[in-house]
Amino acid sequence: EPCVEVVPNITYQCMELNFYKIPDNLPFSTKNLDLSFNPLRHLGSYSFFSFPELQVLDLSRCEIQTIEDGAYQSLSHLSTLILTGNPIQSLALGAFSGLSSLQKLVAVETNLASLENFPIGHLKTLKELNVAHNLIQSFKLPEYFSNLTNLEHLDLSSNKIQSIYCTDLRVLHQMPLLNLSLDLSLNPMNFIQPGAFKEIRLHKLTLRNNFDSLNVMKTCIQGLAGLEVHRLVLGEFRNEGNLEKFDKSALEGLCNLTIEEFRLAYLDYYLDDIIDLFNCLTNVSSFSLVSVTIERVKDFSYNFGWQHLELVNCKFGQFPTLKLKSLKRLTFTSNKGGNAFSEVDLPSLEFLDLSRNGLSFKGCCSQSDFGTTSLKYLDLSFNGVITMSSNFLGLEQLEHLDFQHSNLKQMSEFSVFLSLRNLIYLDISHTHTRVAFNGIFNGLSSLEVLKMAGNSFQENFLPDIFTELRNLTFLDLSQCQLEQLSPTAFNSLSSLQVLNMSHNNFFSLDTFPYKCLNSLQVLDYSLNHIMTSKKQELQHFPSSLAFLNLTQNDFACTCEHQSFLQWIKDQRQLLVEVERMECATPSDKQGMPVLSLNITCQMNK
Amino acid sequence: QKQYWVCNSSDASISYTYCDKMQYPISINVNPCIELKRSKGLLHIFYIPRRDLKQLYFNLYITVNTMNLPKRKEVICRGSDDDYSFCRALKGETVNTTISFSFKGIKFSKGKYKCVVEAISGSPEEMLFCLEFVILHQPNSN
């Protein structure tokens, strides 16, 4: 069975084809090759003789037991080698020779028992080494690591490491500029020798499900003393054994680390007193809780020095009391409990993401809701009912505003966005908005992107609501049940590049409303009911137009519409997916491609 | 279409069939077997995925006695620092995991429940597997 040609001459997918050898019928130019789940079993010298351009090679689950010297020799362009799930028993010292550009080596679940004997010391370009899910017992980083000066990610998770000693990390002292992220999760740790991490700098350290008791956690964290880490991730996994007890003493040792960003990811335990618990983390710049349950929500008004707070997928009794002077970014997403938003006091806040919480807002939005006048980014998407009762007073700095899939009330009663002259991006898609007021977008003089799909208009008519949006480049009006539009609806949009009118109820096409769109490149009218043109004589679309989508409409392929069908043929170079432009009527021509019709007035005779 | 039996409990019988062409082997055990009136137990899964599990989600299509409920999307793996350790599993890596579950107080009417589970993962998104579970529910059976 042949391999699947994904990208001709470049990418070949040969997964699970029962190959016992490397195929010899693929082009020399192949760059990406997936041979996974084939019983190759043995890789001899120069196994990839015929693949000089190879950049990505996937050999997952190929039952490989032996890799000989020079198996990958001359693959000088190879950047990614994946060996996941191979029961390697014999790995020659020169197994990886010739890989002078290798950046990513994945040897997950390959029976690797030690880093010491892993012959990769010459791979100077290596950036990522993943040896998770193996049998490694010692965390001693061999001397050859001093050659791996580009290493950025080392994944040792799911191994058998129990202890870390001072000597294990000696090589890292010789590499002070290393930007290394280290994942040690799911190793059954019970001892970290104090001083082992002294004066070590890491970009990221992840320790999840490493400790089987509170005491072990406490002493191991104390063993991290002296570590300087940009990002520290602690926590557990839902489907692994969890700590029976967790209290403030667990994290006391963090006072002896220098941490820029901290994250606690999943804890099967109720956090009550977070002030005491995170006492050593009051001055990290970024603090993050993922999938934890928080009892006392008042604690977030303590004088923490965080600049970025992230609360994701957490459970709260009610919406937390947030009073944080220095906070610039707040991400509060996909949380449960506390369905009603309550005011926060965050005077330095510039970025606020409150998406996917099912929150309702009694009044939105003004400075008093968020306690800041510095807000530039506000995401309230995928929430409940949001009642627009204020026109963003004090929030004039806003540049990005997203309400998609929330239920907006009172949107058409006044110019809600009047003060947002700096706004660049607005998404009110699927917000149950019914446009009944022409001044709905007044004030948005800087707006470049407007997404309002899935809403509706009074009498299914698009009026002149865009007159002030002179900088608009992207407009999405799909799924709005539109049937007609004002001939001057788009007259002021001379910068518009993309216009999506798909999934509406237009029965005819008219070029007149688009005559002022001098920058228009993409016009999508797919999934309407277009049968014919509005006027007998259709003019040309703007000369800038490059893509016109008229697929899945109801074209009437009859003689009376001959000029329209001819006009469509004349637009051929603009049309996309022409094979999906089919006649709907008359019945004998139903399903025929519009462009293949021979349009003469013999058509219906 | 071969039917794979999972387990029987006092009020339910659970089995599944594949609803995809690939039919890559997956082993599913529930202990103790689910009782629909209330249940607490462990779901054990053994599986070798044909793609990375990063950004795994399920599309669930549930039918109750021929009535179709709206499609439900359940995100399992968001993509970073996920709740489940198997979210970091790579294509070809053995997934051998036990997940605890519990629910109570749901009143199910007697009948046949079908649930098509479409597992989607990776970037670009592709189907990982598709299983159609059938639960025959007899509330008062012993």
Epitope: K21, I22, D24, N25, F28, G44, S45, S47, F49, S50 | -
Partner: nanobody, 117 residues
Framework: EVQLVESGGGLVQPGGSLRLSCAAS????????MGWFRQAPGKEREHVAL????????YYADSVKGRFTISRDNAENTVYLQMNSLRPEDTAVYYC??????????WGQGTQVTVSS
């Protein structure tokens, strides 16, 4: 078993030309691809040019494109490498290699090419 014998190497001035030959004998029916590789002192062996026996498709390394030409003579079971516009950086031992359908690779003993004024 396949035997490969190279010839044609030597000393040449920059800008000059050489033609290398590689004669194959033995189980030549099993060969799927043949090619020329080179190895400079202290460097890894690298691809220069490849040719597919079945359909004659060809590959050249970027560094030799437009200067070197690989060809084959099926009747003589020989593969050639015509090297024009030679540069000092082309100095290396040139090896002929043959890959069989079973992914086994055979090598010649190598021929020295030196480009120097």
């Amino acid at each position: 078993e396949v035997q490969l014998v190279e010839s044609g190497g030597g000393l040449v001035q920059p800008g000059g030309s050489l033609r290398l030959s590689c004669a194959a004998s033995g189980s030549i029916f099993s060969i799927s691809d043949m090619g020329w590789f080179r190895q400079a002192p202290g460097k890894e062996r690298e691809h220069v040019a490849l040719i597919r026996i079945k359909d004659g498709s060809i590959y050249y390394a970027d560094s030799v494109k437009g200067r070197f030409t690989i060809s084959r003579d099926n009747a003589e079971n020989t593969v050639y490498l015509q090297m024009n516009s030679l540069r000092p950086e082309d100095t290396a031992v040139y090896y002929c290699g043959a890959k069989t359908g079973t992914s086994f690779v055979y090598w010649g003993q190598g021929t020295q090419v030196t480009v120097s004024s």
